[in-house]
């Protein structure tokens, strides 16, 4: 005996013209009726409506409306989904990949989420991670290979090497931009003491007892002294690079000008300072005439020495 099909109770959907059609049930095998699926649900063929068929075994499909999950519901930071489809049906698994430098919670470069009855099984997670760095003159105190954000990796220097000022152990932290710093251990013999003092000048920073290799220290000269050379020195192989010199200024005094019956051209200073290489213009005092060449009245300051012209 052919079993009729009772009125179909379609979860998350229904028959079109349901109230009119109720009269036709139970229905005989072979009968088909159009039906629709609610929002976020689709028919097994992937559309929003289809036909439900009465068969000898009952209604087909047995689950007329399948849950769908939308790609737009996925919030993925620091990763991407390469599949082109925008709608995924129940139990469909979707793959996602993490950007370089990021990994899933279990440390893989890719992961998957599944469309379940209540939506996606989870949101994709791509956590910042740091790979084991390359160590120079040192070794890691951990045998892990991948480290999560905020993880700390301790390391120690080989014998004869240190991190800073006698410390031989250190740690680096995995941050958003990678490791907090590069684990560097330098040869203890390459440290420098305080940089050399210079005459008529000084360092711009307070002095340490020990400087690590590649440290830079800046010098400055006293007022009116001119810095010659680089104003920085660098610690390399236990030695500082050549410090600068502070070149004496030329001090033009009223006494020296009176001796030579001259005065500064266009200036009334009693004392005037000029740097090396500066040109100082003189002229004869009223009632005096030049006793030296015209060129000598444009004197050039050379490391504190200036040759004064003379007027008689």
């Amino acid at each position: 005996e052919v079993k009729p099909c009772d009125f179909p109770e379609i979860q998350h959907g229904g028959l079109y013209y349901k109230s009119l059609r109720r009269l036709y049930f139970p229905a005989a095998a072979g009968q088909s009726y159009s039906y629709y699926c609610d929002q976020n649900f689709v028919t097994p063929s992937g559309s929003y409506w289809d036909y439900i068929h009465c068969t000898q075994d009952g209604w087909s499909p047995t689950v007329p409306c399948l849950r769908t999950c939308s790609k737009s519901d996925i919030e993925i930071e620091n990763g991407f989904i390469s599949e082109s489809s925008s709608i995924y049906i129940l139990n469909k698994e979707i793959q996602y990949k993490c950007k370089p430098g990021y990994a899933t919670a279990d440390g893989n470069s890719s992961g998957s989420i599944t469309c379940l009855q209540n939506g996606w099984s989870a949101q994709p997670i791509c956590i910042k991670f740091c790979d084991m760095p390359v160590f120079e003159n040192s070794r890691a105190k951990s045998n892990g290979m991948r480290f999560k954000l905020h993880d700390t990796l301790d390391y120690e220097c080989y014998d004869g090497y240190e991190i800073s000022y006698g410390n031989t152990t250190g740690s680096i932290v995995c941050g958003e931009d990678g490791w907090s710093h590069f684990p560097t251990c330098y040869n203890s013999s390459e440290k420098c003491g305080p940089p050399p003092p210079i005459s008529n000048g000084d360092t711009t920073s307070f002095l340490l007892k020990v400087y690590v290799p590649q440290s830079r220290v800046e010098y400055q000269c006293q007022s009116y002294y001119e810095l010659q050379g680089s104003n920085y020195v660098t610690c390399s192989n236990g030695e500082w690079s050549e410090p600068p010199r502070c070149i004496h200024p030329c001090i033009i005094t009223e006494e020296n000008m009176n001796k030579n019956n001259i005065q500064l051209k266009g200036k009334s200073d009693i004392k005037y300072y000029a740097k090396t290489g500066d040109t100082i213009e003189f002229m004869c005092k009223l009632g005096y005439n030049a006793n030296t060449s015209v060129l000598s009245f444009q004197a050039v300051c050379r490391e504190g020495i200036v040759e004064y012209p003379r007027c008689e």
């Epitope: 000022y165 006698g166 203890s188 440290k191 003491g193 003092p197 307070f206 002095l207 007892k209 020990v210």
Partner: antibody, heavy 124, light 107 residues
């Protein structure tokens, strides 16, 4: 109790080398947390720091500009002492010479322990 | 180099009084880099204060240091007979230099 014991001649002739030694007891010249200094005191120049030696995985010597070309400070680990050599002395170098310890850290230079001082006269 | 000028040259006070000694630097010295010493006749100097305000081991709390930049002060709150001596300031920011000293004498 840490002590510094100074020794050396009290009279040096001009142009010769002034040499003083400072023996350390209760601490080590190669300590990683101390530096060993020479300071002198005269009526004309007051207290004047001359230089230091210290060990931080390797030996460092730092000298004052005023004596840089004439001074050497040597540590002697076998005897746990350090010495001062100041050459080409003149009567201007007549002073009381103190050896001192500095226990300041990387940045600090201050002297928490002093020897008794040696009066050195430069005279022919 | 940094020149330290101490004032007054001589300070005459009585036991029980408060002493204020000044040390002025020719250029700015971080407060971390100033120390004070006491020297009695025929003796070596003794460290009192380092880092401008930290008392050295065994120094009584009547000694205190303060100041920053170019002006520093050593204060002895209540003078004891053994406090009459010469006091020196010292900077150690760039090389090491000492002040000329202040003689604290009994009035």
């Amino acid at each position: 109790q840490v002590q510094l014991q100074q020794s050396g001649p009290g009279l040096v002739k001009p142009s010769q080398t002034l040499s003083l030694t400072c023996a350390i007891s209760g601490d080590s010249v190669s300590s990683n947390s101390a530096s060993w200094n020479w300071i002198r005191q005269s009526p004309s120049r007051g207290l004047e720091w001359l230089g230091t030696t210290y060990y931080r995985s390797k030996w460092f010597n730092v000298y004052a500009v005023s004596v840089k070309s004439r001074i050497t400070i040597n540590p002697d680990t076998s005897k746990n002492q350090f010495s001062l050599h100041l050459n080409s002395v003149t009567p201007e170098d007549t002073a009381i010479y103190f050896c001192t310890r500095d226990r300041g850290d990387l940045l600090h230079w201050y002297f928490d322990l002093w020897g008794r001082g040696t009066l050195v006269t430069v005279s022919s | 180099e940094i020149v330290l000028t101490q004032s007054p040259g001589t300070l005459s006070l009585s036991p029980g009084e408060r002493a204020t000694l000044s040390c002025r630097a020719s250029q700015s010295v971080s407060s971390s880099y100033l120390a004070w010493y006491q020297q009695k006749p025929g003796q070596s100097p003794r460290l009192l204060i380092y880092g401008a305000s930290s008392r050295a081991t065994g120094i009584p709390d009547r000694f205190s240091g303060s100041g920053s930049g170019t002006d520093f002060t050593l204060t002895i709150s209540r003078l004891e007979p053994e406090d009459f001596a010469v006091y020196y300031c010292q900077q150690y920011g760039r090389s090491v230099t000492f002040g000329g000293g202040t003689k604290l004498e009994i009035k």
